[in-house]
Interface confidence: low
Amino acid sequence: SAPGEDEECGRVRDFVAKLANNTHQHVFDDLRGSVSLSWVGDSTGVILVLTTFHVPLVIMTFGQSKLYRSEDYGKNFKDITDLINNTFIRTEFGMAIGPENSGKVVLTAEVSGGSRGGRIFRSSDFAKNFVQTDLPFHPLTQMMYSPQNSDYLLALSTENGLWVSKNFGGKWEEIHKAVCLAKWGSDNTIFFTTYANGSCKADLGALELWRTSDLGKSFKTIGVKIYSFGLGGRFLFASVMADKDTTRRIHVSTDQGDTWSMAQLPSVGQEQFYSILAANDDMVFMHVDEPGDTGFGTIFTSDDRGIVYSKSLDRHLYTTTGGETDFTNVTSLRGVYITSVLSEDNSIQTMITFDQGGRWTHLRKPENSECDATAKNKNECSLHIHASYSISQKLNVPMAPLSEPNAVGIVIAHGSVGDAISVMVPDVYISDDGGYSWTKMLEGPHYYTILDSGGIIVAIEHSSRPINVIKFSTDEGQCWQTYTFTRDPIYFTGLASEPGARSMNISIWGFTESFLTAQWVSYTIDFKDILERNCEEKDYTIWLAHSTDPEDYEDGCILGYKEQFLRLRKSSVCQNGRDYVVTKQPSICLCSLEDFLCDFGYYRPENDSKCVEQPELKGHDLEFCLYGREEHLTTNGYRKIPGDKCQGGVNPVREVKDLKKKCTSNFLSPEKQNSKSN
């Protein structure tokens, strides 16, 4: 395990005094209730805090909200409740913060039952001022900003109307009725499903998918018999009912729904579901639920068109529709994902992939750790990570795994060491190489966060008792120092730092409780004086990502290229700074067959890297196309794995084949496509 506070640890000198001078307490003049916190913009230092307190009366619930604003990363707060006319804000809608640094904020107010519509408060200057606007409808969802233009908003009403505003919520227009789900696409496009007969629930599987590219002036029906739809990366997915039974199947479009292809995925029955686990512009991870109430399914990874899928992982834990899965994108290293599988004996085990789902393996056992009671062999076992599923099961796991793109290689997670996840109290483990190797970082469950792009890690012990101590490390979790941030312990409720892990400020939230009152309190600690100087060239070292065999010329090659990073030395105590940019040097690898997946009509026999011709089946489902409709498809049998950048080497080109009699999508024939004007 990691060394403690002994001679191996280079302690930060005078850190108590340095931190004491940079610890800021704010007591909120509030009854406890609930609190929500939002950062407004990036690197602005603006934080909005909304506290709400419900007073249940005999006939109705009376609510009180208070709004506070900080512009110095939480060191000081000002009560700005008067800017929203002391109105009770609906916390279920949260604070709708605009994209990028637009400075836009929308708060949705609670209104009395008989009113014609809802009420919102709008700010476009980082919450310095708010404008009250009465709505011509009662909102069902939070206002959704167009990613391209923060003046464009959409919302669904309680009567299933689709409402759009073109002037940041000043004026609203209902562009369609009977709408179930609406989403912004790219280029200010709106996709939505509508029902014709009864309701969203009654018409599930008989919905139509519509598109408007001009904010409701004109519409195009782009799908029928729709169960649901989703957007991921550049892909538009629709789950479509089959003609002859109650199964449904995924269809994919990469041109905003003008043309569709049937995804080569299994169809699912009424009790099953599909879930997009992760998507980018290259590819998609798709979970397909197993029949029956198994709690697991299969992960498939797509090609660059989102059409051809390869089985990636069997028995993938995913409890029910909208339930829990541990699938986690490790953002600190390209190609790495962690998730859980449900083994045959119903134990839960953690798996990791380093090549975007190509191969999965167990996590390596941390050095100097012992296998727990779940292990059959006390010398051979793996690390198993606690994530969403463990949290949902109320295990003693306060936080999901954490990684940040600018803290290269760092992954922090709760875990246990054995043959499967243990229900015993977990410890906190850290990897500094993107999940290849692990070390015990802290004994017992903790809250943790990354500051200054990995230069500092902060942790607080998870306890039912009041706390007043924070732990921090400047060497990626090897050595820890403790700082008592207050004499009076508080009931801890959360750790908050600015998203992006570039800040050096951490806010500790909690409440104090006396005989009569409970008050919200925050402590914001600035670590700038701990990291006294800016990092220089000598503070960084070259690190080859995904390196497993330094002797091998292709060492570090993942998806056709390797990357060398400049990483902060563990022994360097210095500031990366807010403007820190990850320095990486990519180099292209030679192609091997591993850089290609098999195209539609081809497959890889077990333990073989060559793609050979496939029976004329539609993916894996049953309309085997024995006597199916013909489709003209030319292929050489291989397609480059999405995102793979290899060059030279193996070039698996064979003669171009005409594959006929492949099943095609009858999802929406051209004659059914129509355009409508409003």
Partner: antibody
Framework: QVQLVQSGAEVKKPGASVKVSCKAS????????MSWVRQAPGQGLEWMGI????????SYAQKFQGRVTMTRDTSTSTVYMELSSLRSEDTAVYYC??????????????????????WGQGTTVTVSS | EIVMTQSPATLSVSPGERATLSCRAS??????LAWYQQKPGQAPRLLIY???TRATGIPARFSGSGSGTEFTLTISSLQSEDFAVYYC?????????FGGGTKVEIK
């Protein structure tokens, strides 16, 4: 344990229909496809078709197209094979067999055939005037 | 449809000897091939799937090999319970098809 139990022997007249049942137990019924295979006296095995218990979709061998109907009842974990317009050459033992082809195939990139791993005991159908 | 041809039709072997059964496909079936054993009055039993993988509970004396169009089932040392009819079956292209069978009898 995993079992497929078929209905009893049948004697039919030419032109009639026969419906054979196959009840599955010991595994999740909807997790595997089901094939039907027949064997005429002293002859080899002949594949008739396959059904997906999830949606009930089917695929039949060309030879039986129009005469065979495969159905399933998920509430009782039973599949049925009905053969109509019987003739004397349809006299055979009819087997249902669990066929994991659908579960094994992971889309075009990694299809792998697992074989018909569990068979029913067989149902003898005799067609005679 | 893909035609599966088995040879020989009958194979006479003494107990303890090696038996080699052949199966040929009219076009490539890759490794989507299974072997079954059938004894009189019984249902077939899966021996080999994926051309070379032994099914659960099948003794190690049974092995399968081949890919594409040519496949072999080998019984390294015949036991008395191995005398039966053996069928190969392809599942590469619908309809699934069986070979005509090879009868392994006692010499």
């Amino acid at each position: 344990q995993v079992q497929l139990v078929q209905s009893g022997a049948e004697v039919k007249k030419p032109g009639a229909s026969v419906k054979v049942s196959c009840k599955a137990s010991g595994y999740t019924f909807t997790s595997r496809y089901m094939s039907w295979v027949r064997q005429a006296p002293g002859q080899g095995l002949e594949w008739m078709g396959i059904i997906n218990p999830v949606g009930g979709s089917t695929s039949y061998a060309q030879k039986f197209q129009g005469r065979v109907t495969m159905t399933r009842d998920t509430s009782t974990s039973t599949v049925y094979m009905e053969l109509s317009s019987l003739r004397s050459e349809d006299t055979a033992v009819y087997y249902c067999a669990r066929d994991p082809s659908g579960i094994a195939a992971a889309g075009p990139a990694s299809r792998y055939y697992y074989g018909m791993d569990v068979w029913g005991q067989g149902t003898t159908v005799t067609v005679s005037s | 449809e893909i035609v599966m041809t088995q040879s020989p039709a009958t194979l006479s072997v003494s107990p303890g000897e090696r038996a080699t059964l052949s199966c040929r496909a009219s076009q490539s079936v890759s490794s989507n091939l299974a072997w079954y054993q059938q004894k009189p009055g019984q249902a077939p039993r899966l021996l080999i799937y994926g051309a070379s993988t032994r099914a659960t509970g099948i003794p190690a004396r049974f092995s399968g090999s081949g890919s594409g169009t040519e496949f072999t089932l080998t019984i390294s040392s015949l036991q008395s319970e191995d005398f039966a009819v053996y069928y190969c079956q392809q599942a590469r292209l619908g309809p699934w098809t069986f070979g005509g069978g090879t009868k392994v009898e006692i010499k």
